[in-house]
């Protein structure tokens, strides 16, 4: 029988009536175009729509759009579509909403073609008010809001200027022409690259990379000869061009660029690319593109600087610059990432791995799955998961794989078990321990969203035909019920749920079709009534992660540190409420090798644990360049891995003296930085 | 090997308390829960709660709430179990018992090693 | 609490019969069940887990079936070891709850 449909699974008493009542319909009075949606900060209940409808006419497209606001999680909405003077929004900028929970939110207006700006609507107040503003400059991109403080905003404009608002785009200023890309980094630094001959195409790897930390009043060149650049966690990374060719490398800071070393990574040609994975404050995956149109690269981890990377996993499915990738971090655990390879058949391989890269395996086949067609061998095989490029390849999978951070160990993700992805249609596959195992949850594609930390997971059928069912659980998955939430079915096109997994709220969003007109609607349902009472102590249960032997003593052991977490327990219904916090105790591994990367000089042979020396290095002083300083290494192979708080145990040796000599490794060194003032 | 090893019998007057150890050997003692189940003469099996011994945390039945206390020393791998208030039907054998685990699971599985047992008389 | 009835509460068999001792919870358990052998004076022993599944070190005539309420043990061709007091044990919800007991004599 399909899971859930098992006679243990407890029936939730009198669902139907308590959904019934918690659900509400709205209908949007306007013609189907496209519909955007976003929430307005944390737990505010507050939902902007956006619906644009164009109509091409024979010499202009005309365009219309509406606003609706909700402040009940999408029970009920409001026309508030004269609050932006009946305006037509540029739904390619989307709404731009503030970071955390400033209720700031920037929409960018469609202008007629002689204008000599832009137009944007700004509210601070949840939407509820908003203010016009006529812009100096068309807007080329959708406006940042700097992380720290989100009345300072910036934009490019059509012209390649680099624009600055300081009171929330009430007053721009122009600080910078000429501008390809600009980023907000910490500390309201605007880091961004110019061109000083054509065009920002024409001088690639001719650009400079400057940094203003005062909102243009002061500038400093800190990188030349620049391709392009990134940031991740601490790290500021910029590919250079090599002086004598076409190829470049990756240089990394971790002072704002005031310093750079140069990656310890291989160099990349004309139609290769790099490309930042993941980042945090502690280290970074980085894909290196294959030399040919192969559509695979290697991914390499770094250390502690960013500066001595491991290689971690070849063959990694990434198919051009800004392209598709499988490369998925599971947040729902410490140190797991799933990501896809390309195996010399051509087939395409899910792996996963939970140290953070350091060991990458297949994932374990669901125990209540058989092989499929792809398998050699029929009774062993392994699950795997669609993701990015699946969807790309226009499969039948409507959702990339999901976890969230407070609903620990769970993740959701479409899959098949055989030796590799499967064309055929796929499966709802969903694990509670991070994906060490996995259990098939539903059958055939389906929309899915996690509610209330985990204690609800709710799933839509991937359907052409219209719908009217929804599917949840309260178990994790295990045992399912289905709600009919209206007599007339609608034609699907969304889930939306509050980000953070924290609500108790859906919303089903669709439209009718009848013989003349099709209209926008939505079905919000509040399963609070599902879990009618807060959960108690008895209600959790203790689970130790990254468990694989009970018996071992280092067992659960990750980064040289293991974590018990109280989990809820599948058969309590109860809820976890919107301010539930996890709940986990560390505890501190002793040191082992395999709490070790391999240092500059060293590698790792195949399934040894031993970090041996690099033949070609053999017998040489292990000199590079670092902050634009020679630097004499003296080591027994070893580097802590980022993050691991092992103690005791194994302890190898590591020195690094200063050489005392200068080496600019093909970069801007300190002394030859320039600033200048505005 | 894995084993648990218990104190000795046990004659206490009503009114009084008792505690009973329960030395944990052959395995890791922080990484399983560990129970305690009496068993009064001629009767079945009665579960009183549990202790986790790296956290310390405790869950007790409702029925044991108030007299019993479940504590542990890590630095010995020992577990405790302590009863106050001794009436005569408290009279039974005790046990500690260790959580089986699977995976990362601590609850669920049953109870796959057991103390020898601790007989309690209670009389006056 | 979730009460667990299991039946009969005695029976006589002979060496080499098959057995068949059954359990079921009040309310449904998933599987989440677990049945133990005690013999006299000793300290009960863990048979079967998570409803079916062999412990190690047991002997295969055990068998453990079931799921939500009604589950059953079944030893296959009883051994002479095997007279004993046998106890289904609930581990689903808090408080751990355990059958009343079935006790298998000699005939």
């Known amino acids: 029988s399909a899971p859930g449909e098992d006679e243990e699974c407890g029936r939730v008493r009198d669902f139907v009536a308590k959904l019934a009542n918690n659900t509400h319909q709205h209908v949007f009075d306007d013609l189907r175009g496209s519909v955007s949606l976003s929430w307005v900060g944390d737990s505010t209940g507050v939902i902007l729509v956006l619906t644009t409808f164009h109509v091409p006419l024979v010499i202009m497209t005309f365009g219309q759009s509406k606003l609706y606001r909700s402040e009940d999680y999408g029970k009920n909405f409001k026309d508030i579509t004269d609050l932006i003077n009946n305006t037509f929004i540029r739904t390619e900028f989307g709404m731009a909403i503030g970071p955390e929970n400033s209720g700031k939110v920037v929409l960018t207006a469609e202008v007629s073609g002689g204008s000599r700006g832009g137009r944007i609507f700004r509210s601070s107040d949840f939407a509820k008010n908003f203010v016009q503003t006529d812009l100096p400059f068309h807007p080329l991109t959708q406006m940042m809001y700097s992380p720290q403080n989100s009345d300072y905003l910036l934009a490019l404009s059509t012209e390649n200027g680099l624009w600055v608002s300081k009171n929330f785009g009430g007053k721009w200023e122009e600080i910078h022409k000429a501008v390809c890309l600009a980023k907000w980094g910490s500390d309201n630094t605007i880091f961004f690259t110019t061109y000083a001959n054509g065009s920002c195409k024409a001088d690639l790897g001719a650009l400079e990379l400057w940094r203003t930390s005062d909102l243009g009043k002061s500038f400093k060149t800190i990188g030349v000869k620049i391709y392009s650049f990134g940031l991740g966690g601490r790290f500021l990374f910029a590919s250079v061009m090599a002086d004598k060719d076409t190829t470049r490398r990756i240089h990394v800071s971790t002072d704002q660029g005031d310093t750079w070393s140069m990656a310890q990574l291989p160099s990349v040609g004309q139609e290769q690319f790099y490309s930042i994975l993941a980042a945090n404050d502690d280290m970074v995956f980085m894909h290196v593109d294959e030399p040919g149109d192969t559509g695979f690269g290697t991914i390499f981890t770094s250390d502690d600087r960013g500066i001595v990377y491991s290689k971690s996993l070849d063959r990694h499915l990434y198919t051009t610059t800004g392209g598709e990738t499988d490369f998925t971090n599971v947040t729902s655990l410490r140190g797991v990432y799933i990501t896809s390879v390309l195996s010399e058949d051509n087939s395409i391989q899910t792996m996963i791995t939970f140290d953070q890269g350091g060991r990458w395996t297949h994932l374990r086949k669901p125990e209540n799955s058989e092989c499929d067609a792809t398998a050699k061998n029929k009774n062993e095989c392994s699950l795997h998961i669609h993701a990015s490029y699946s969807i790309s390849q226009k499969l039948n999978v409507p959702m990339a794989p999901l976890s969230e951070p407070n609903a620990v160990g769970i993740v959701i993700a479409h899959g098949s078990v055989g030796d590799a992805i499967s064309v055929m249609v796929p499966d709802v596959y969903i694990s509670d321990d991070g994906g060490y195992s996995w259990t098939k949850m539903l059958e055939g594609p389906h929309y899915y969203t996690i509610l209330d930390s985990g204690g609800i997971i709710v799933a839509i059928e991937h359907s052409s035909r219209p719908i009217n069912v929804i599917k949840f659980s309260t178990d994790e998955g295990q045992c399912w019920q289905t709600y009919t939430f209206t007599r007339d079915p609608i034609y699907f096109t969304g889930l939306a749920s509050e980000p953070g997994a924290r609500s108790m709220n859906i919303s089903i969003w669709g439209f009718t079709e009848s013989f003349l007109t099709s209209q926008w609607v939505s079905y919000t349902i509040d399963f609070k009534d599902i879990l009618e009472r807060n959960c108690e102590e008895k209600d959790y249960t203790i689970w130790l992660a990254h468990s694989t032997d009970p018996e071992d003593y280092e067992d659960g052991c990750i980064l040289g540190y293991k974590e018990q977490f109280l989990r809820l327990r599948k058969s309590s219904v109860c809820q976890n409420g919107r301010d539930y916090v996890v709940t986990k105790q560390p505890s501190i591994c002793l040191c082992s090798l395999e709490d070790f990367l391999c240092d500059f000089g060293y590698y790792r042979p195949e399934n040894d644990s031993k970090c041996v020396e690099q033949p070609e290095l053999k017998g040489h002083d292990l000199e590079f360049c670092l902050y634009g300083r020679e630097e004499h290494l003296t080591t027994n192979g070893y580097r802590k891995i980022p993050g691991d708080k092992c103690q005791g145990g194994v302890n190898p040796v590591r020195e690094v003296k200063d050489l005392k000599k200068k080496c600019t490794s093909n970069f801007l060194s300190p002394e030859k930085q320039n600033s200048k003032s505005n | 090997q894995v084993q648990l090893v218990q104190s000795g019998a046990e004659v206490k007057k009503p009114g009084a308390s008792v505690k009973v150890s329960c030395k944990a050997s052959g395995y890791t003692f922080l990484a399983y829960y560990m129970h305690w189940v009496r068993q009064a003469p001629g009767q079945g099996l009665e579960w009183m709660g549990w202790?986790?011994?790296?956290?310390?945390?405790?869950s007790y039945a409702q029925k044991f709430q108030g007299r019993v206390t479940m504590t542990r020393d890590t630095s010995i791998s020992t577990a405790y179990m302590e009863l106050s208030r001794l009436r005569s039907d408290d009279t039974a054998v005790y046990y500690c018992a260790r959580g089986k685990r699977s995976s990362g699971w601590y609850e669920g599985y049953g109870m796959d090693v057991w103390g020898q047992g601790t007989t309690v008389t209670v009389s006056s | 609490d979730i009460q667990m009835t299991q039946s009969p509460s005695s029976l006589s068999a002979s060496v080499g019969d098959r057995v068949t001792i059954t359990c079921r919870a009040s309310?449904?358990?998933?599987?989440?069940l677990n049945w133990y052998q005690q013999k006299p004076g000793k300290a009960p022993k863990l048979l079967i887990y998570?409803?079916?599944s062999l412990q190690s070190g047991v002997p295969s005539r055990f068998s453990g079936s079931g799921s939500g309420t009604d589950f059953t043990l079944t030893i296959s061709s009883l051994q002479p070891e095997d007279f004993a007091t046998y106890y289904c044990?609930?581990?689903?919800?808090?408080?751990?709850?355990f059958g009343g007991g079935t006790k298998v004599e000699i005939k």
């Open positions: 044990q609930q581990s689903d919800v808090s408080p751990i709850t």
């Open positions: 202790i986790n011994p790296s956290w310390g945390s405790t």
């Open positions: 998570a409803a079916s």
């Open positions: 309310q449904s358990i998933s599987s989440y």
